[in-house]
């Protein structure tokens, strides 16, 4: 950055490099050139020059001044005007920035994504710091009362492994930067209690010629966990409400589930599960979408991780991929 | 019945590339991921990768990555695996076997391959 | 990656012996845990998975037991048929990795 230009002089700011974003800042800057009595003094913020608000304090120092201050990060570098010097001096430069301190962590959440190997806890950081900002997760035994702490820039993966003091801990999130530092609430997990099944997956599905049409969805999960219960959305394209049944199942087999739908419709479907009784569920799963025929033939659909449809006389159903805002169950 | 045909031994050179096959039958080809086992001559078993046919997903043991390619053609019901770049360590017996959960229900009878110059 | 260690490359047994293999994870599996039989020349066929549910087929002289980080594949009344490698495997972590295994000879 350009603070690593040699100097000839000192810049500083007031009341700090960083600061509080909307403060009123100094900047100040003082020559040190040899064989020179500067005749002006000039700021530059990332390359320009400024023209407003420089006052000048005395023969070798000036002072800018900035009113509510609103950029996250500048460059600031000063220079002399030296008589007999054809071309401005650099005299020093410096990186400011400005931001916020952080918000209290809250929604502080550690899961075990099934096969993953890793306890995952995550937080709502609140309102953007714009500075650097780290967070300290702390996990602590209640068996053990032993702690350990990591270090991070956003959410945590622990390694199951590391969690050696029984199955019951508190978890807390610290969070620091220039400007300040906050705590979390403490979370109280037992590790038996944050497993989320392996993804479920929605593989295919078919529309079977009856007096009333109906559709098989078929859909899957690796999971190893006996009792689970599960969540399927559907509803039409064109429509903003979905429609939600529930299912209890041990993933034995593959999971066949009807729906009577309307025909010549495209509709499209997700899935997600969690350990029954338990608190986290899965992230849905990607979107699954089948177009009902408009009579009465068997239509058999597939599921396709890009968006392409199949060509022909059979209706393709697709599941489009990653569309979903958080994918970590499709571990394993 | 369930079944898992895998393609004949291959003798190939190093810094060449092989496929090999699994043919499955007796159940429905999207319902099980297919998954790859290496062993070497006397050694273990090291899990390579699987695919699954319902939505083409792969997840690879990273030792693999970059060495190891799985494709199915849902039309003929065959799961293949491509090795490049072979050295004398890639000389062993692949097996394709498939699972609903992460452990291996069916095998395949194995694919010897043979890098030697 | 779960390292998994069983102790005894090989052991030598009689047949009707009660033989116990061991098996034991750098980590704690939460009972993800299978094992496997291996005859020279075939593939290696499922015994237990979940540390101890039976595979299809198995018969009961096979027992597998165990938690945490050590589990153990039994076989109450040793038969001929029973000689052969048997190797654990661990689906806790992805990679899902196995034991080097343990070859049982007659003596």
């Known amino acids: 950055g350009i603070t690593n230009i040699n100097c000839s002089g000192h810049i500083w700011v007031e009341p700090a490099t960083i600061f509080k974003m909307g403060m009123n800042i100094s900047i100040y800057c003082q020559a040190a050139i040899k064989n020179c009595q500067p005749r002006k003094l000039h700021f530059y913020k990332n390359g320009i020059k400024e023209r407003f608000q420089i006052t000048r304090i005395n023969k070798t120092t000036a002072r800018l001044w900035y009113k509510n201050f609103l950029e996250p990060h500048a460059s600031m570098y000063c220079t002399a005007e030296c008589p007999k010097h054809f071309q401005e001096t650099l005299i020093c430069g410096k990186d400011i920035s400005s931001g916020y301190p952080p918000d209290i962590p809250d929604e502080v959440t550690c899961v075990i994504y099934e096969y993953s190997g890793n306890m995952t806890c995550t937080w709502n950081a609140g309102k953007l710091t714009y500075i650097d900002t780290k967070y300290v997760v702390h996990v602590k035994s209640l068996e053990t009362e032993e702690e350990q702490q990591y270090l991070t820039s956003s959410y945590i993966n622990i390694s199951t492994d590391s969690l050696q003091g029984g199955k019951k801990y508190l978890v807390w999130v610290q969070a620091a930067n220039a400007l300040g530092m906050e705590e979390s609430k403490q979370l109280q997990i037992h590790l038996d209690d944050i497993v989320i099944p392996s993804a479920a997956v929605i593989s295919r599905a078919e529309t079977i010629n009856a007096t009333v049409p109906k559709t098989i969805i078929y859909w899957d999960s690796q999971t190893t966990i006996e009792k689970v219960s599960c969540e399927m959305r559907y509803k039409a394209t064109t429509n903003q409400t979905w429609n939600v049944k529930e299912f209890d199942t041990n993933f034995t087999y593959v999971q066949q589930s009807e729906f009577y739908l309307e025909p010549n419709i495209k509709y499209v479907f997700q899935v997600r599960c969690q350990e029954t009784g338990k608190r986290y569920w899965q992230p849905w799963s990607s979107l699954f979408f089948h177009k009902t025929p408009e009579t009465v033939p068997q239509v058999t659909s597939k599921a396709f991780q890009h968006d392409t449809w199949n060509s022909g006389l059979t209706v393709a159903s697709i599941s489009t991929g990653h569309l979903t805002s958080d994918n970590r169950g499709d571990i394993g | 019945q369930i079944q898992l045909v895998q393609s004949g031994p291959e003798l190939v050179k190093p810094g060449a590339s092989v496929k090999m096959s699994c043919k499955t039958s007796?159940?429905?080809?999207?319902?099980?991921?297919i998954n790859w086992v290496k062993q070497r001559p006397g050694q273990g078993l090291e899990w390579i990768g699987w695919i699954y046919p319902a939505i083409n997903n792969t997840n690879y043991n990273e030792k693999f990555k970059g060495k190891a390619t799985l494709t199915v053609d849902t039309s003929s019901r065959t799961a293949y695996m491509q090795l490049n770049s072979l050295t004398s360590e890639d000389s062993a017996v692949y097996f394709c076997?498939?699972?609903?959960?992460?452990?291996?229900?069916?095998w395949g009878q194995g694919t010897t391959l043979t890098v030697s110059s | 990656d779960i390292q998994m260690t069983q102790s005894s490359s090989s052991f030598s047994v009689s047949l009707g012996d009660r033989v116990t293999i061991t098996c034991k994870a750098s980590?704690?599996?939460?009972?993800?845990l299978a094992w496997y039989q291996q005859k020279p020349g075939n593939a290696p066929r499922l015994l237990i998975s979940?540390?101890?549910s039976l595979g299809t087929g198995v018969l009961s002289r096979f027992s597998g037991s165990g938690s945490g980080k050590d589990y153990t594949l039994s076989i109450t009344s040793l038969q001929t048929e029973d000689v052969a490698t048997y190797y654990c495997q661990q689906y806790w972590s992805i990679p899902w990795t196995f034991g080097a295994g343990t070859k049982l000879e007659l003596k």
């Open positions: 980590e704690d599996l939460y009972n993800r």
């Open positions: 007796g159940y429905t080809f999207t319902d099980y991921y």
């Open positions: 979940g540390a101890t």
């Open positions: 076997a498939i699972s609903r959960k992460p452990y291996f229900d069916y």
